[in-house]
């Protein structure tokens, strides 16, 4: 009897949908695996007789519940199927946005770039998929614990009237208000402000 794959799960970030599993202990030799997806009531092969422990399902439609399954194989024997259900638009993890930061005197000018999507045109981003897409920005004075959050209305934001000659750190994430779903924070970007722009009288 061939044991089934273990710890079968979907790892999906920005619609890069990778079905992953672990190979069970099997004394007779090396196992291969077949992964399938349900399409119009028929299971279709996606990865056949692979020695890998993952299979790329990024070409699935973003909408709807998909039934995926994987089994282990050895010679003419095979395990039972292990099934999972996956809805990309609901289940995919929202990866961190890109961010450009520029210092202008005592202000930080930030521009945000929505995450790109696997198997899509360069310009079709997570912002196109989710109508309610917005950004959360978090910033703090470097070396302090107090963090401030803002929700920009656009793809850019300016933090004004900051303390001069002080290092501020900023990070951004995508947020979907209609789903109350937050994405992953970007890596902090830390920049030092320069002089106060006010002109002495």
């Amino acid at each position: 009897m061939v044991p089934p794959p273990e710890n079968v799960r979907m790892n999906s970030v920005n619609f890069k949908n990778i079905l992953q599993w672990e190979s069970p202990a099997f004394a007779k030799g090396n196992l291969t695996f077949t992964a399938q997806y349900l399409s119009y009531r028929i299971f279709q092969d996606k990865c056949m007789n692979t020695t890998l422990t993952e299979c790329d399902f990024s070409s699935l439609s973003k909408y709807g519940d998909h039934t995926l399954r994987v089994r282990a194989e050895f010679a003419d024997e095979h395990s039972d199927w292990v099934n999972i259900t996956f809805c990309p638009v609901d289940d995919t993890i929202i990866g961190p946005p890109g961010m450009q930061v520029e210092v202008l005197a005592d202000s930080l000018h930030m521009r945000f770039l929505a995450p790109k999507i696997e198997n899509e045109y360069e310009t079709w981003t997570m912002k196109n998929v989710y109508n309610s897409w917005t950004y959360n920005v978090q910033y703090w004075k470097n070396g302090t614990d107090e963090k401030f959050q803002i929700t920009p209305q656009y793809d850019f934001e300016v933090l004004r009237n900051l303390e001069p000659w002080t290092t501020y750190c900023v990070q951004v994430r995508g947020f979907l208000p209609d789903r109350n779903k937050a994405g992953e924070w970007s890596e902090p970007v830390c920049e030092q402000t320069t002089h106060d722009e006010t002109v002495p009288s």
């Epitope: 909408y63 310009t123 196109n128």
Partner: nanobody
Amino acid sequence: EVQLVESGGGLVQPGGSLRLSCAASGNSLDYPTIGWFRQAPGKGLEGVSCISASDGSTHYADSVKGRFTISRDNSKNTVYLQMNSLRAEDTAVYYCAASLFGLGCKSEADYDYWGQGTQVTVSS
């Protein structure tokens, strides 16, 4: 049942232009995303372009960027693909597709309704 009808294909010389049209027979073409795809002889389906109804944004495959332009005329319920500077490698059957949910642009899996296609041949 929605029926998409493409027109405007034909034979054109390299460097020439064509304008393809996509209309919904007896229906409004009121879908979140309308896309154009093509299939060259012996090859798979390839995404060419799409237009989003929500913001009017347009998106293109690298291979056609700067040469093709997608647009829509809501009064005529028609989406167009203007193809300029045509090359031999643009020869294919071109399909129009409509998405009910508008979540994707390039992947055929994200589209729900398809036309029958129109042949474009670029040859001297």
